[in-house]
């Protein structure tokens, strides 16, 4: 089975760890795929190690473990993320995470200050 936090949040400009945990008494993990919606983020293979898709190579760091660290988050990164565990002999297992990227607290404070500033 796949165990993961279904919903997580992070601040714009910050980073977040995407993590799925696979547990099985018999099956061994051979490959893990990570996708942002329909877009491939990264792949881990027991044979080949990690490969981060070139589109994300400046923002995605493999790990910890079989998870991913997604950096320099933007509001556009809000959405569904999927981990797919390829196992032998167990088959394929999928997990889903919804990431909500929020405005940074600095931005929110700045916006509040701007809104309450007296008009000249």
């Amino acid at each position: 089975t796949i165990d993961t936090k279904r919903n997580i949040s992070a601040e714009e400009g910050g980073s977040v760890i995407l993590q799925c945990h696979f547990s099985s008494d018999t099956a061994e993990v051979t490959q893990v795929d990570w996708k942002q919606q329909d877009q491939l983020l990264a792949i881990y293979s027991v044979d080949l190690g990690w490969h981060v898709a070139s589109v994300f190579s400046d923002r995605v760091v493999p790990g910890p473990s079989l998870g991913l660290t997604f950096q320099s988050l933007t509001m556009n990164d809000t959405g569904e993320y999927f981990c797919t565990y390829h196992t032998y002999p167990g088959g394929i297992y999928k997990g889903r995470i919804f990431l909500k990227v929020q405005e940074s607290s600095d931005d929110r404070n700045g916006l509040a200050q701007f809104q309450t500033a007296p008009l000249g």
């Epitope: 490959q31 996708k35 329909d38 877009q39 491939l40 792949i43 293979s45 044979d47 080949l48 490969h51 898709a53 589109v55 032998y88």
Partner: antibody, heavy 118, light 107 residues
Framework: EVQLLESGGGLVQPGGSLRLSCAAS????????MNWVRQAPGKGLEWVAY????????GYADSVKGRFTISRDNSKNTLYLQMNSLRAEDTAVYYC???????????WGQGTLVTVSS | DIQMTQSPSSLSASVGDRVTITCRAS??????LNWYQQKPGKAPKLLIY???SLQSGVPSRFSGSGSGTDFTLTISSLQPEDFATYYC?????????FGGGTKVEIK
Amino acid sequence: EVQLLESGGGLVQPGGSLRLSCAASGFTFSSYSMNWVRQAPGKGLEWVAYIKSNSGTKGYADSVKGRFTISRDNSKNTLYLQMNSLRAEDTAVYYCARGPYDYWLDYWGQGTLVTVSS
Amino acid sequence: DIQMTQSPSSLSASVGDRVTITCRASQSISSYLNWYQQKPGKAPKLLIYAASSLQSGVPSRFSGSGSGTDFTLTISSLQPEDFATYYCQQSYSTPLTFGGGTKVEIK
């Protein structure tokens, strides 16, 4: 530098057999899935077969299933394609190609021509 | 089997032109779509993998986009060495299947 070198092509009569080889160098051959892809003269690309790194999983196009057998010898860094019951429509350039993560074909050999004709 | 349909089958363009080739899958293939370039008498060369990721060493004038069933390969400014045939290929499921190819010729 990654290199893939096919050999074993040639002229064979319909119903005959041929074994193609692909010698790999410049990478850890035993870690990669490998594929055979062919191209008939003046035509497009057609995937033929693949084999996973440990030889545990193989797959074939319907057009060659039961006639062609893919295999590998990781100790020799070599991929093979045994082709039996050859038909005229098997005439093509046969390429071996490396398949990292099973999702794309990043390096290809130069190809070897198989001609099936009486 | 998943059918891959490329269009156009051929096109004529000039150096410096922006060129767009499309590929449509008969069912959703997520982002498991690759693009290859082939020159006469040579082996295919990987340009774009996973729909939009540029293969190492490939010039940045090549780009890919799309997901699901509709995909595009764009050459932002055609160079003399880009005249070739381009193929899309799905790796969502076996059998792996290729589009019929798009031949880019000199106008």
